[in-house]
């Protein structure tokens, strides 16, 4: 417990103190007092620096004194032989004696009393920033007019904080400006504008005079601007050292002016105003901004339109433009939206063709369609090259978005027919020589494939069986071989409207318009043994002349057997129609004059006994295309004849091309179109 006074005596005082003693006393007087310690008796063994025996006086970490030897008072009116005055309220006294004393020493007697200290003058550090007032046991600080005492009860400052400025324009100055600003103060000013406006501060160099920085460059007095997580300053010195126009990019600004105890100057004055928050003109790739301005501010709206071939995608849908607003935080809305290349997706596959796997399906990518050569070619042109267009479609320069169409190559046998000599008078053939050859099993007859869905034959072949079974792709028509060949299923039979239907077909003498089409249920896949024959062109180039050679093929009657098992073929010339008329009809069913000969018929044969016969009906009379020697076209169809092995009559296909085309067109599926 602190005491106001006390006595301290060495051990055994006034008797001699013992050897090897160490004793300490902790003196404490109340706060606000100092200590006056004085000795009235001192008799301690003398040694150099009081090394043997001593009394030590310690204040905090400081040794105030170390005593030994004998002392007497210099003043006859005072018993004090040694004294100490400290301005602190704590003191320690330590007495030490060593192991031997050659004489008898009586030690010391000391007293302490609490004394008032003058905190205002007794310390190096002045406790008050302005006025210091001492009283017994303490002191208090006070301030000049217009200042107030801070919570630490020592420092005075001016009341310059708490102002909030919300107007869009204003002026703020340091206290007393342009008179010297108060020392030892912290002034805080707040500017709070509506969201969407940024505080812009403007100063003039001459409106700023604040105590300069120290030698280390630290401002002793400073002005700081804080906007969110951005700080401008600290600033100090004569003339404003910072930018004269500060765009804070924030609607909230704190201005902090901090001063120390010394060096007052005139201070500062600034103006501020609210600017609509600017948004940066962002570089958004692959797009254009409308309107295009040098500067965009709060509430500005731009339309961002993607360049051709680019789009904004969300989920499975896209858009080519969007709107973006400059927001109150200085950022654009919809900044997540980016114009990315249009994706045309995986290209559609096509029948009888393929498209290479694209490296990319994005805008500008190129793909190529090819047909399954040599059996198909690209009918609608365009070269098969498509690029990914801006609208998200694969587009061809010629066809646009229409897909290429792979159609069968006509009239090109995989292997040319070579007569091995001596149908009648013909040779063995391979189906690869006549890949268009179609076999009808009931009645036993032939036909010609003219495209994926259509077979051309003679009307008399199908008049009695409107659901014929047909086969393609086999040289042999043995039952076991046919099982492995391709069977064609008819969907509908179209007989030429000019073909006269009879009650008794066997008695027919008029074979005019002996032509029919069979529509197939499913498309035929082309290959080396199956491919169509061409139709004649409509130009005069396709008018047959006597002597023009044509090929016939079929499984009909031969010299040796009623029906052939393996395909036979023969090359025979076109002859004048009169040659056919002159031949006596074998087994006539009517008067010879009753047989009708028309311009719709071609007469051919008469050489080396080569002719078509029963069972070859409907097969093609194939003639080399005058405009493309690699191809054959169906100039005729095996129709009838007066006598096998002489001349035969063939339906003149050229006269029916319009009917064929019209029939096919009117009865096609959308896929064929």
């Amino acid at each position: 417990e602190p005491t106001m006074y006390g006595e301290i005596l060495s051990p055994n005082y006034p008797q001699a103190y013992p050897s090897e003693v160490e004793k300490s006393w902790d003196i404490e007087v109340p706060e606000g007092y100092g200590i006056h310690l004085y000795f009235t008796h001192l008799d301690i063994e003398l040694s150099e620096n009081c090394a043997y025996d001593s009394v030590q006086i310690i204040s905090g970490d400081t040794e105030e004194g170390r005593l030994c030897g004998q002392r007497s008072s210099n003043n006859p009116h005072s018993p004090i032989v040694e004294e100490f005055q400290v301005p602190y309220n704590k003191l320690q006294v330590i007495f030490k004696s060593d192991f031997s004393n050659e004489e008898r020493f009586t030690g010391f007697a000391a007293y302490y009393v609490a004394t008032d200290i003058n905190e205002c003058t007794d310390f190096v550090d002045v406790p008050c920033s302005h006025f210091c007032n001492n009283f017994i046991g303490g002191y208090f600080c006070s301030c000049p007019p217009e200042y107030f005492l801070h919570d630490d009860m020592k420092n005075c400052g001016v009341n310059c904080s708490g102002d909030v400025f919300t107007a869009l324009i204003g002026e703020i100055a340091s206290p007393n400006y342009p008179k010297p600003y108060p020392e030892n103060s912290r002034c805080e000013y707040q500017i709070r504008l509506e969201k969407g406006f940024q505080v812009v501060v403007t100063l003039r160099r001459e409106d700023f005079d604040v105590e300069a920085a120290d030698s280390a460059g630290n401002c002793l007095d400073s002005l700081v601007f804080v906007a969110g997580d951005r700080q401008f300053g600290p600033y100090c010195g004569h003339g404003f050292p910072g930018p004269l126009n500060i765009e804070t990019k924030s609607n909230a600004l704190d201005i902090i002016f901090q001063t120390d105890l010394t060096g007052q100057k005139k201070g500062w004055k600034l103006r501020y105003h609210g600017d609509p928050m600017p948004c940066p003109k962002e570089d958004t790739p692959n797009s254009v901004w409308e309107p295009d301005k040098a500067k965009y501010v709060f509430r500005d709206v731009v339309q961002i339109t993607c360049l051709d071939g680019f789009e904004v995608v969300e989920g499975r849908v896209g858009a080519t433009s969007f709107y973006s607003t400059c927001q109150s935080n200085g950022k654009w809305s919809n900044s997540k939206l980016k114009c990315q290349p249009v994706d045309c997706g995986i290209p559609e596959s096509i029948e009888n063709g393929k498209v290479e796997d694209p490296e990319s399906t994005l805008f500008g990518s190129v793909i190529r369609y090819t047909c399954e050569e040599p059996y198909y070619y690209m009918e609608n042109g365009g070269g098969g090259e498509y690029h990914c267009a801006g609208n998200g479609s694969w587009v061809n320069e010629v066809l646009g978005p229409e897909l290429p169409k792979c159609v069968p190559v006509c009239g090109v046998p995989r292997e040319p027919f070579e007569e091995k000599q001596r149908i009648i008078g013909g040779s063995d053939a391979d189906i690869k020589n006549f890949p268009w050859q179609v076999f009808f099993d009931n009645p036993w007859a032939g036909g010609a494939l003219i495209n994926e869905y259509w077979v051309l034959t003679a009307a008399h072949v199908v008049e009695g069986n409107r659901e014929p079974t047909m086969y393609v792709g086999s040289t042999s028509v043995q039952t076991s071989r046919l099982a492995k060949s391709k069977m064609l299923t008819p969907e509908h039979v179209f007989i030429h409207p000019g073909w006269k239907l009879l009650e008794v077909p066997e008695g027919r003498t008029n074979f005019d318009n002996d032509i029919a089409l069979v529509r197939l249920k499913d498309p035929v896949k082309m290959g080396p043994t199956v491919s169509p024959i061409c139709l004649p062109g409509t130009s005069s180039d396709y008018n047959l002349m006597d002597g023009d050679l044509g090929l016939i093929s079929g499984w009909g009657r031969t010299e040796k057997r009623d029906r052939a098992v393996r395909l036979k073929a023969a090359r025979l010339p076109v002859a004048p129609l009169r040659k056919c008329k002159e031949v006596k009809v074998e087994k006539p069913t009517a008067d010879a004059e009753a047989y009708v000969f028309t311009p719709n018929m071609i007469c051919a044969g008469g050489e080396k006994g080569m002719d078509s016969c029963k069972g070859d009906s409907g097969g093609a009379f194939a003639v080399q295309d005058p405009n493309d020697k690699t191809k054959f076209y169906a100039a005729g169809l095996v129709s009838w004849g007066p006598q096998c092995g002489t001349y035969g009559l063939y339906t003149r296909v050229k006269n029916y091309v319009d009917w064929i085309m019209k029939t096919m067109q009117e009865n096609s599926t959308p896929r064929e179109d």
Partner: antibody, heavy 116, light 107 residues
């Protein structure tokens, strides 16, 4: 597939706060804006604000400024909406929604009832 | 803030009818307008975006038109599942605002 699952119904006293969560799956919320829309009983839809979870930027409707806080935790792919100083007229179904071009996906809604 | 006004507030119609709902913006919103359908107890569903684009999976009987301040949602032939409340919303500038809704009821 894309889903937004919101926290369950809440009953609060006037003056209290409520925090509604919206857990996203099937997409990364950093790639979208997350909006909050409310609908008082038998009333229309009212947009409250949005957050860009990528950088925590927020925009609030003036009506809710100072009372609403929208946050997002990208580590859990979840958006939150906190509304303070609740009053009886804040009783509503609160929806979260995802957008870039439009509000294509919505949460199932969270009913918040404010009653003394 | 941009105000969105829908009309009518409610309307009664029969299955098969052609129905038109209009939405007017207090200022130009170009084509930044979306239409939503909401059924009782359900969240809203997007029908039309950017004024005229049908969202994926939305039946072709729904169509949108307009730009600037006047917009229309048309249902060409009402189906039983179309009876609901329809909202327009502008996404031209924040705050994004909704119309007050049009309740489509069965006659």
């Amino acid at each position: 597939q894309v889903q937004l699952v919101q926290s369950g119904a809440e009953v609060k006293k006037p003056g209290a706060s409520v925090k509604v969560s919206c857990k996203a799956s099937g997409f990364n919320i950093k790639e979208y804006y997350m909006h909050w829309v409310r609908q008082a009983p038998e009333q229309g839809l009212e947009w409250m604000g949005w957050i860009d979870p990528e950088n925590a930027d927020t925009i609030y409707a003036q009506k809710f400024q100072g009372r609403v806080t929208i946050t997002a935790d990208t580590s859990t792919n979840t958006a939150y909406m906190e509304l303070s100083s609740l009053r009886s007229e804040d009783t509503a179904v609160y929806y979260c929604a995802r957008s870039r071009l439009f509000f294509a996906y919505w949460g199932q809604g969270t009913l918040v009832t404010v009653s003394s | 803030d941009i105000q969105m006004t829908q009309s009518p507030k409610s309307l009664s119609a029969s299955v098969g009818d052609r129905v038109t709902i209009t939405c007017r913006a207090s200022q130009d919103v170009r084509t930044a307008l979306d239409w939503y359908q909401q059924k009782p107890g359900q969240s809203p569903k997007l029908l039309i975006y950017s004024a005229s684009y049908r969202y994926s999976g939305v039946p072709s009987r729904f169509s949108g038109s307009g730009s600037g301040t006047d917009f229309t949602l048309t249902i060409s032939s009402l189906q039983p599942e179309d009876f609901a409340t329809y909202y327009c919303q502008q996404q031209y500038t924040t705050p994004y605002t909704f119309g007050q809704g049009t309740k489509l009821e069965i006659k």
